[in-house]
């Protein structure tokens, strides 16, 4: 049987001879050279050689455990003469023994980290890690300990974990922002003779809001003309803040002073300046100087620093309003006036008023812009602003008159203002109702009494748009002698009815009926319209054959009825549209 132990070999051998590993030996070996030892497996014949007579194994090269810690080989013992094995092939191990030949290596050459300024002592910054290629299971060759070589007293490192923490209170970014820390990792548990490696950690303090804004001066003075429209910038103020980013953002506000309602302050997000702007129209004559208290404050405050004081500052802003010669100002932006359409000439409608807003209070004269009143329907008293009519009005012609009045400073005609006047003409019942169309109808000679031969409709130009209450009747001069009657339908229509049985076109070929139409408005208006009724010869179906001795041309299929309209079509000579007549025979 084979006789050997597991072999151990020290790495990194530096001797001049081959490094002896061990001896293979079979108890069948009598020392007479009859046995031959053969080696195969990892590195056999290359890294490891064997004396085939004695079984001695040697390493031919320097071995590195960190490259390969274990070699697995096979041993054979054969009869040199027959070549037959005298022992079964056997596997054995050569284990490479570690020496401390590797220094710790950090995962990064340079670490970058940030930590808020003013952080409490012991605040985590970053963790560094170094690894050692030596055998961690044997001795302390791979046991790494961390220490700080550079960066005290600001930072510390935990020896076992490599965690870097703040070590100094109140580190102020505004004082110093960048720190370079050098960390050492040493093996052998940090003992003498251990190997070491270092890394650099660049630490930046990030900003926290630990500084309030500060105005560089306590008072600012600006000027603006009184004519500045709302939104006009007057001036810029700027508070400085040692912080950066959002911690240096500043909001400006007007906290006090007489001009709180007259001015605004807005923040320019680009420059962090406060822009004072006009909020309402200024008036030099009312107030010449405004004193404001403007506050600059940080919108993003860290409560833990409030003990340092309020994160705001204030300054006084004095605004001087410069006088500007202003045009007259009307008492209203626009005037709406009403006048009845039956107003006499020189009727006063209303008045406008304007005055010079300047301290001088120059007198004002009024005029109508004739481009807006070409027909000179209205006039104005140049002294007192009274508007009056200079022509008669008619609502049915024009409901609204839109004119412009000008107020001009007498002493300075260049200074003038304009104001629109909207004059509504109120309706008066001054139009009589009229027939909606020209009515010409016919009656058959054989018509019976009380036949409806025409329906009348009326229209009226006056209000109301939504409807009128019209009444219809025969004119008094025709009422008693008429051959026809009017039936008021009470729905703003009326019917013409036959009053007798039969008409003779040879006796009377055409009747002219004067119909009086009135509204029930105030004052009542009426007109008389004439309806022409022709007497016609008709066939027994009620179709016209001739009227007033004139031949009639019928459009095919048209006939007429007792209750239907007959209309003369202007433009066609005596062509009537007809509907069927109901005969009473």
């Amino acid at each position: 049987s084979w006789m050997w132990n597991q072999f151990f070999l020290l790495e990194e051998y530096t001797g001049s001879d081959y490094q002896y590993v061990g001896k293979l030996h079979s108890d069948q070996d009598r020392g007479d050279g009859s046995l031959k030892y053969i080696l195969s497996g990892d590195g056999a014949g290359d890294l490891f050689i064997i004396n085939e007579n004695t079984g001695d194994i040697q390493a031919t090269k320097r071995l590195d455990r960190e490259e390969k810690p274990v070699y697995i080989l096979r041993a054979q013992a054969v009869n040199r003469r027959t070549g037959r094995p005298v022992e079964p092939e056997s596997e054995f191990i050569i284990k490479i023994h570690d020496i401390n030949d590797n220094e710790p290596i950090f995962t990064k050459d340079v670490y970058t980290a940030t930590v808020p300024e003013m952080a409490d002592v012991g605040t985590f910054v970053v963790q560094v890690t170094a690894t050692d290629a030596d055998d961690p299971t044997y001795g302390n060759s791979a046991k790494v300990v961390y220490s700080i070589l550079q960066g005290q007293p600001y930072f510390s490192v935990e020896s076992e974990t490599g965690i870097i923490k703040t070590a100094l209170l109140n580190m102020d970014r505004e004082n110093r922002e960048q720190y370079q820390v050098v960390i050492q990792a040493k093996d052998m548990g940090g003992q003498m003779g251990g190997l070491s490696g270092t890394t650099t950690v660049n630490i930046t303090l990030t900003d926290v809001n630990d500084n309030p804004p500060r105005f560089p001066q306590s008072t600012y003075q600006f000027k603006t003309p009184e004519s500045s429209p709302p939104g006009t910038p007057i001036g810029r103020i700027k508070a400085s803040d040692a912080d950066v980013g959002e911690n240096a953002e500043i909001e400006y506000s007007i906290t006090d002073g007489e001009g709180h309602e007259m001015f605004d302050v807005i923040t320019d997000q680009e420059t962090q300046e406060g822009i004072i702007t006009v909020k309402k129209l200024l008036d030099f004559e009312k107030k010449k100087v405004y004193t404001l208290k403007v506050e600059a404050s940080n919108p993003h405050v860290e409560p833990r620093f409030l003990y340092l004081g309020p994160f705001k500052d204030s300054a006084t802003v004095r605004i001087v309003v410069d006088d500007v010669d202003e045009p007259p100002v009307f008492s209203k932006l626009a005037y709406i006036l009403q006048i009845r359409e039956d107003a006499r000439i020189n009727t006063t409608i209303g008045s406008v008023a304007a005055q010079d807003p300047d301290a001088a209070r120059n007198p004002v004269k009024y005029s109508v812009d004739r481009h807006t009143d070409m027909d000179r329907i209205f006039n104005i008293d140049s002294g007192n602003g009274s508007i009056f009519t200079s022509k008669l009005l008619d609502r049915e012609t024009l409901l609204w008159h839109n004119i412009t009045v000008i107020a001009t400073e007498i002493n300075n005609p260049k200074q003038s203002s304009r104001v629109p006047l909207y004059i509504k003409v109120l309706d008066v019942n001054d139009n009589a109702p009229e027939f909606a169309e020209f009515y010409e109808t016919f009656v058959c000679e054989k018509a019976k009494a009380d036949q409806l031969i025409q329906t009348l409709r009326a229209v009226d130009k006056d209000d109301p748009y939504s409807g009128h209450q019209f009444s219809f009747s025969l004119a008094p001069e025709a009422a008693s002698s008429s051959n026809f009657t009017i039936q008021d339908n009470k729905d703003n229509t009326a019917g013409i009815l036959t009053r007798k049985n039969g008409y003779n076109r040879h006796e009377m070929s055409t009747y002219l009926l004067p119909v009086v139409i009135s509204d029930n408005d105030y004052p009542v208006q009426s007109s008389t319209g004439t309806v022409t009724v022709r007497v016609c010869a008709c066939d027994h179906h009620g179709n016209m054959q001739s009227c007033h001795a004139e031949a009639l041309i019928h459009p095919t299929g048209l006939s007429t009825g007792a209750g239907s309209e007959f209309r003369h079509d202007s433009g066609l000579n005596d062509i009537f549209e007809a509907q069927k007549i109901e005969w009473h025979e």
Epitope: R340, N429, P464, S471, P476, D521, Y522
Partner: antibody, heavy 116, light 107 residues
């Protein structure tokens, strides 16, 4: 059906004021002129005032001009008569009536008594 | 103002009688005359407008005629419900004026 309903009458001292109302229904109120007519106890009818459909024009009998004001609210279908500086001779039943020339519908009337 | 004068101021008649009431204007009013009927404690009721046009719902026994200054209201056959006071009213010009009334009583 057309209905007119007056209210607001009562006893008032000479020089006092009253406001009469007339609520209209059953027709397009905004299309009609509306009138007030009064009747003193045991006497005939007297036209008082009229207002056109849009309210743009108003007219009064001489006996009430400057003291009475007629008005209307077309959105509420209501006619009004504001009576100021009332006199004993204003004592009457006041009717509101539809129309500006002929009065085709009348309310039931409201009695106004002016007496100290 | 235009004065309107009715005659008679009162009359007695029997059911079935033909009754005529006249109204005279102090100046021509064309056909702008209305007739109203009023019963005690009630509002007036329009009978005739524009001198001769019968208001809808009014019985055909009522008729009106005339123009200019003289007008007539005729009840062709008096019915029990026709006993009332009748007024004429002109609406030719402002102010609109009423007649003093004609009282029709049962004989």
């Amino acid at each position: 059906q057309v209905q007119l309903l007056e209210s607001g009458g009562g006893l008032v001292q000479p020089g006092g004021s009253l406001r009469l109302s007339c609520a209209a229904s059953g027709f397009t109120f905004s299309s009609y002129a509306m009138s007030w007519v009064r009747q003193a106890p045991g006497k005939g009818l007297e036209w008082v005032s009229v207002i056109r459909s849009s309210g743009s024009s108003t007219y009064y009998a001489d006996s009430v001009k400057g003291r009475f004001t007629i008005s209307r609210d077309n959105s509420k279908n209501t006619l009004y008569l504001q009576m100021n500086s009332l006199r004993a001779e204003d004592t009457a039943v006041y009717y509101c009536a539809r129309g500006g020339g002929y009065f085709d519908y009348w309310g039931q009337g409201t009695l106004v008594t002016v007496s100290s | 103002d235009i004065q309107m004068t009715q005659s008679p101021s009162s009359l007695s008649a029997s059911v079935g009688d033909r009754v005529t009431i006249t109204c005279r204007a102090s100046q021509s009013i064309s056909l702008w005359l209305n007739w109203y009927q009023q019963k005690p404690g009630k509002a007036p009721k329009l009978l005739i407008y524009a001198a001769s046009t019968l208001q809808s719902g009014v019985p055909s026994r009522f008729s009106g005629s005339g123009s200019g200054t003289d007008f007539t209201l005729t009840i062709s056959s008096l019915q029990p419900e026709d006993f009332a006071t009748y007024y004429c009213q002109q609406y030719y010009t402002s102010p609109y004026t009423f007649g003093q009334g004609t009282k029709v009583e049962i004989k």
